[in-house]
């Protein structure tokens, strides 16, 4: 069905890393452009990077208004240079995206190690808070002021001298752990988020060593 | 859990009026498109109309088309159909559904017969 | 507007059975179809949307199938709850059309 030589979007794919979120789909188009809607449940279609030969779509702005609700896009299909064009149902030539919940989806950005702290046998590793593009009251929000106690880290220590790694958990942003003292530690952070059912972890944090940069801040 | 209840089916006259209401519990009301579906007496489903959840966006079948208006106050969770200039192939039960993207029927009332007749 | 022919339009079965209903549109409507259960005096009920997702508390028994034109219902094991008359729809564009129902009897 569809208008005469024009193709359905195909493959649509979201891609959403801390609520920064792009809908990407197949083909290149050949003598044909897009136009992009997306609509929560409530049926209020929103068009998005009008008549483009690209193939995605960046809908950040869009989910950010409410990452707990399920959303969903369409990708239009037009014949370049005759956009009013339509199919034989009087509508132009569409594919849905999967269902998107920006807050149950959206993966987790890699962590950063703010800084660490030794002091005798304890160690404090600290998380940067990562911004993300949820806004309220126009300001962005951070990560775990969108997650709230959804969100944990793991962390992974091992001695600098040894092969074998222990592991912490945390509801906040801070591990304090216990430690040997006068000893040196490697460790890295992921982020969690234990009630989901994908995308639950983030990618490992690069890994600090104690002794390297003397946990100064890095930000 | 959802409900929806409708309302405001009865007898009426060919040329005459009814609106029908549908009332919902159980989900955000405002955040779901919805719909109008009947079906006339031992006969199929055929929709009817359609309204997105801000209450912009409205759909018709083409038969009720300038007769029927489709509205809804958010807040009071109530989905309505005015019905104007009835015929008698407008007799049919009608349903409210709930519908997601105003796609597809997720969830049902119970049904109101609307008969015309003389 | 689309047409949407079911088929059969009736069928006789016993509770066990396999039982396959099928759905043809009159033109492309991709994955954009739905599928609904409906008894005597009731109001119906949502069993498949997109062609192939199971709605929230359908036994998984109920599995749906298909693309553009041609779409199948299947219930892997009749139960004796499902004897009931069944309808497909599109959502592809309006006005949205069912098909005219197949009803599944009790052989």
């Known amino acids: 069905s569809g208008t005469t030589n024009t193709v359905a979007a195909y493959n649509l794919t979201w891609k959403s890393t801390n609520f920064k979120t792009i809908l990407e789909w197949e083909p290149k188009p050949v003598n044909q452009v897009y136009t992009v809607q997306i609509s929560t449940k409530s049926g209020d279609w929103k068009s998005k990077c009008f008549y483009t030969t690209d193939t995605e779509c960046d809908l950040t702005d869009e989910i950010v208004k409410d990452v707990k609700q399920t959303y969903l896009a369409r990708v239009f299909s037009y014949p370049a240079g005759n956009v009013e064009s339509t199919g034989s149902a009087g509508e132009p030539l569409y594919e849905n995206s999967p269902e998107f919940t920006p807050y149950l989806e959206t993966n987790i950005g890699q962590p950063v190690i703010q800084k660490y702290e030794q002091g005798g046998t304890k160690l404090k590793v600290t998380v940067k808070d990562s911004f993300t593009l949820v806004r309220k009251n126009g300001t962005f929000l951070t990560l775990r002021q969108v997650f709230g106690n959804d969100l944990g880290y793991i962390l992974t220590y091992r001695k600098s001298s040894s092969s074998g790694k222990k592991t912490a958990k945390t509801n906040t942003n801070e591990f304090l752990i216990d430690v040997d003292k006068g000893e040196n530690y490697c460790f890295s952070v992921q982020a969690v988020i234990p009630s989901r059912t994908v995308n639950r972890k983030s990618t490992d944090s690069p890994v600090e060593c104690m002794g390297q940069e003397k946990g100064e801040f890095r930000e | 859990e959802v409900q929806l209840l409708e309302s405001g089916g009865g007898l009426v006259q060919p040329g005459g009026s009814l609106r029908l209401s549908c009332a919902a519990s159980?989900?955000?009301?405002?955040?779901?498109?919805m719909s109008w579906v009947r079906q006339a007496p031992g006969k199929g489903l055929e929709w009817v109309s359609s309204?997105?959840?801000?209450?912009?966006?409205?759909y018709y079948t083409d038969s009720v088309k300038g007769r029927f208006t489709i509205s809804r106050d958010n807040s009071k969770n109530t989905l309505y159909l005015q019905m104007n200039s009835l015929r008698a192939e407008d007799t049919a039960v009608y349903y409210c559904?709930?519908?997601?993207?105003?796609?597809?029927?997720?969830?049902w009332g119970q049904g109101t017969l609307v008969t015309v007749s003389s | 507007d689309i047409q949407m022919t079911q088929s059969p339009p009736s069928l006789s079965a016993s509770a066990g059975d396999r039982v396959t209903i099928t759905c043809r549109a009159s033109?492309?409507?991709?994955?954009?179809l739905a599928w609904y259960q409906q008894k005597p005096e009731k109001a119906p009920k949502s069993l498949i949307y997109a062609a192939s997702s199971l709605q929230s508390g359908v036994p998984s028994r109920f599995s749906g199938s298909g693309s553009g034109t041609d779409f199948t219902l299947t219930i892997s094991s009749l139960q004796p709850e499902d004897f009931a008359t069944y309808y497909c729809?599109?959502?592809?564009?309006?006005?949205?059309?069912f098909g005219q129902g197949t009803k599944l009897e009790i052989k």
């Open positions: 559904a709930r519908s997601p993207w105003g796609y597809y029927l997720d969830s």
């Open positions: 309204i997105s959840g801000s209450g912009d966006y409205t």
């Open positions: 729809q599109q959502y592809n564009s309006y006005p949205y059309t």
């Open positions: 159980g989900f955000t009301f405002s955040n779901y498109a």
């Open positions: 033109q492309g409507i991709s994955s954009r």
